[in-house]
């Protein structure tokens, strides 16, 4: 009868219990991007900070090479903000040169990649037309919901335009994701 | 070997367990502000509602003084949007008079103030340029991401422009933070 | 003394501990809405994908005729990002016949039905005038909070024209809770 | 269209206490904050207080012991009380409500004159 | 307590006429000023706000300017409908104390 004591917390517990401050978490913060030819209708990936100012990675949740990897199933909060900028879009020049207005767009998407699929899955998709009269624009791209991940399982943030993200600053533009 | 049967669930456990429901928890919600005058490149502290309608505060985490007070270090969740309107932006008046388009902006910045560091540190921001065309316009920013807080911590959400602030309703402007 | 061991793992739990993989979450995804007819000044609400793709429900938390049914008592953080879109908005045809400039809106509302209580409450709301130059327009509004819900209330995302949600992919237009 | 009407009794003796009560008809009551102001014979608009819509209250320092403002969100109706009147409190009281624009009143009421006589 | 002082107390003048009211505040309210028209017998009318944005409704023949401190009202081309008592208030402080100016008679000529 020693233990009794502690059974009303573990009756309605069906899986392990597991200290929250164990749990696999990362917020990483943007840097300067390197110019990449990418193929038409393929965004080009982001790549990040991970251990300087606010960035970080713990309990096993690991970045490399544009990717956070998942190391242990189950379901995880996934977020990142994307502040992009510009000069005057293409939209307002042809608006101006009194051509059809085809607005302009950024784009960001968070991609998880799995090894065993063939194609990656896109998670999140914030996307906005940008057709601003101002010369100099900019504006945040906000995304974050939750999703059932696997052991393995990579992540990573894509864009349209690599050019017009903003990266001069950490507060402006992140990724992050941590286990629930 | 009483007690053995509840072995297997602490033995990936390095920080003490805790109940959900005890954690530090915060929503607050809008309320009028108090103009301010502030200087140049600081921008003002909003205050919140925190005890009525949807906003409260529990498990120790305080609010007082525009600051949510952090009871204890760990990973937090940390959100804010803010509703700005405003009649017709400076932009677009600027260029109904020919002059130079330099656009309007409006800015969230969530900060927090640690006492033993001088300066406070800028956890999230998101701005935008507005140029707008009609009179009246009105939009959010939203913001949310996850860093590693220290007790004692104090946040807070500052905006470029406190007249511009969207106080009427506690659904669309709000500021809230909890532990992971 | 034989249970003694994992006495101080519980001395700070007020509450029963849970796992955490078994708490109620959902993700809905976007599925094609079927236009309604909704009085003036009341938003018609989503219907959703719960099952397939993306999306899931698990552990109680169960989707029905447009509502997600939250199955036990907490704090919950809860989410949705619409994304809208549309051609030429009204505000610039407005302004085009040289009219007042009465802008074009959309509006995304999470809304808390509670079945003792006669008025539904909005959550959280995200509201953005649209007065766009260009031809084709399209933008997304994200939304999440935490709040504390009651065993049997109902959540519902309505938004200002339903006509306008783009329902072509499930990572532009979601709904989504978890318990804390 | 939005219209406010209100109601009370208009004549009271020194100590008593006034009270008034504004409905709202034909648009939202969530969503904005609510006033009273009062006009003494012959002389100027002075504000006496407001109630937001999570029922948080906001009186005019000079007055605040003596003043209640309550909310009935149910029938769309709020209510003013101003405790211990005295001649100085005689005026013509109205209902207002604040556009969203910092106390700027759109829409007000018809205006209940209060006598405080013995 | 931030005073507002209007001037003229009282002015007339002719339909069509062009007029301008001030409004001087004890310390700087940025743009926290709206204007009222009040009609004997009636409620107050908001016609401007935050010193200068048009309320819905509103004639355009009504104008505001102005910033800090010093503030106008502007009718243009006068109506007989205008004639009546303007109040200007600034909506800075919070809770406002003494928030009306003592009014600007406009009476016909």
């Known amino acids: 009868l020693k233990g009794q004591e502690f059974a009303p917390s573990h009756q309605q517990v069906y899986a392990p219990l597991r200290a929250d401050g164990d749990k696999p978490r990362a917020h990483l913060t943007v840097v300067r991007q390197t110019p990449t030819q990418h193929f038409k209708n393929q965004f080009p990936a982001l790549h990040w900070e991970h251990e300087l100012g606010l960035a970080f990675t713990k309990n096993r949740m690991n970045y490399t090479n544009k990717f956070l990897l998942i190391p242990e199933s189950g379901d995880y909060f996934i977020y990142s903000q994307v502040t992009f900028r510009g000069m005057t879009s293409e939209c307002s020049e042809i608006r101006q040169a009194g051509r059809p207005n085809k607005p302009d767009s950024i784009t960001v998407v968070i991609t998880k990649v799995t090894d065993s699929y063939p194609e990656p899955t896109q998670l999140l998709m914030g996307t906005k037309s940008v057709c601003e009269v101002g010369s100099n624009w900019f504006q945040p791209i906000y995304l974050g919901a939750m999703f059932s991940l696997q052991e393995g399982d990579k992540l990573m943030v894509n864009v349209s335009d690599i050019s017009l993200v903003d990266y001069t600053k950490e507060d402006k533009t992140f990724f992050g994701a941590f286990l629930l | 070997l009483k007690g053995q049967e509840f072995a297997p669930s602490h033995q990936q456990v390095y920080a003490p367990l805790r109940a959900d429901g005890d954690k530090p928890r915060a929503h607050l919600t809008v309320v009028r502000q108090t103009p301010t005058q502030h200087f140049k490149n600081q921008f003002p502290a909003l205050h919140w509602e925190h005890e009525l309608g949807l906003a409260f505060t529990k498990n120790r985490m305080n609010y007082t003084n525009k600051f949510l007070l952090i009871p204890e270090s760990g990973d937090y969740f940390i959100y804010s949007q803010v509703t700005f309107r405003g009649m017709t932006s400076e932009c677009s008046e600027i260029r109904q008079a020919g002059r130079p388009n330099k656009p309007d902006s409006i800015t969230v910045v969530i900060t927090k103030v640690t006492d033993s560091y001088p300066e406070p540190t800028q956890l999230l921001m998101g701005t935008k340029s507005v140029c707008e065309v009609g009179s009246n316009w009105f939009q959010p920013i939203y913001l949310g991401a996850m860093f590693s807080l220290q007790e004692g911590d104090k946040l807070m959400v500052n905006v470029s422009d406190i007249s511009l602030v969207d106080y009427t309703k506690e659904d669309k402007t709000f500021f809230g933070a909890f532990l992971l | 003394l034989k249970g003694q061991e994992f006495a101080p793992s519980h001395q700070q739990v007020y509450a029963p501990l849970r796992a955490d993989g078994d708490k109620p979450r959902a993700h809905l995804t976007v599925v094609r809405q079927t236009p309604t007819q909704h009085f003036k000044n009341q938003f018609p609400a989503l219907h959703w994908e719960h099952e397939l793709g993306l999306a899931f429900t698990k552990n109680r938390m169960n989707y029905t005729n447009k509502f997600l049914l939250i199955p036990e008592s907490g704090d919950y953080f809860i989410y949705s990002q619409v994304t809208f879109r549309g051609m030429t908005s009204e505000c610039s045809e407005i302004r085009q016949a040289g009219r007042p400039n009465k802008p074009d809106s959309i509006t995304v509302v999470i809304t808390k039905v509670t079945d003792s209580y006669p008025e539904p409450t909005q959550l959280l709301m995200g509201t953005k005038s649209v007065c766009e130059v260009g031809s084709n327009w399209f933008q997304p509004i994200y939304l999440g909070a935490m709040f504390s819900l009651q065993e049997g209330d109902k959540l519902m995302v309505n938004v200002s024209d339903i006509s306008l949600v783009d329902y072509t992919k499930e990572d532009k237009t979601f709904f989504g809770a978890f318990l804390l | 269209q939005v219209q406010l009407q209100q109601w009370g009794a208009g004549l009271l003796k020194p100590s008593e206490t006034l009270s008034l009560t504004c409905a709202v008809y034909?648009?939202?009551?969530?969503?904005?904050?609510w006033s009273w102001i009062r006009q003494p014979p012959g002389k100027g608009l002075e504000w006496i207080g407001e109630?937001?819509?999570?029922?948080?209250?906001n009186y005019k320092p000079s007055l605040k012991s003596r003043v209640t403002i309550s909310v009935d969100t149910s029938k769309n109706q709020f209510s003013l009380k101003l405790s211990s009147v005295t001649a100085a409190d005689t005026a013509l009281y109205y209902c207002?409500?604040?556009?969203?624009?910092?106390?700027?009143?759109?829409?007000w009421g018809q205006g209940t004159m209060v006598t405080v006589s013995s | 307590d931030i005073q507002m002082t209007q001037s003229p107390s009282s002015l007339s003048a002719s339909v069509g006429d062009r007029v301008t009211i001030t409004c001087r505040a004890s310390q700087n309210i940025s743009s926290y000023l709206n204007w009222y028209q009040q009609r004997p017998g009636k409620a107050p009318n908001l016609l401007l706000f935050t010193a200068s944005s048009l309320q819905s409704g509103v004639p355009s023949r009504f104008s505001g300017s102005g910033s800090g401190t010093d503030f106008t009202l502007t009718i243009n081309s006068l109506q007989p409908e205008d004639f009546a008592t303007y109040y200007c208030?600034?909506?800075?402080?919070?809770?406002?104390?003494?928030?009306f100016g003592q009014g600007t008679k406009l009476e016909i000529k």
């Open positions: 034909g648009g939202s009551f969530s969503g904005y904050y």
């Open positions: 109630i937001n819509p999570v029922g948080r209250t």
């Open positions: 208030q600034q909506s800075y402080s919070n809770p406002p104390e003494s928030s």
């Open positions: 207002a409500r604040d556009n969203g624009w910092h106390y700027a009143f759109d829409i």
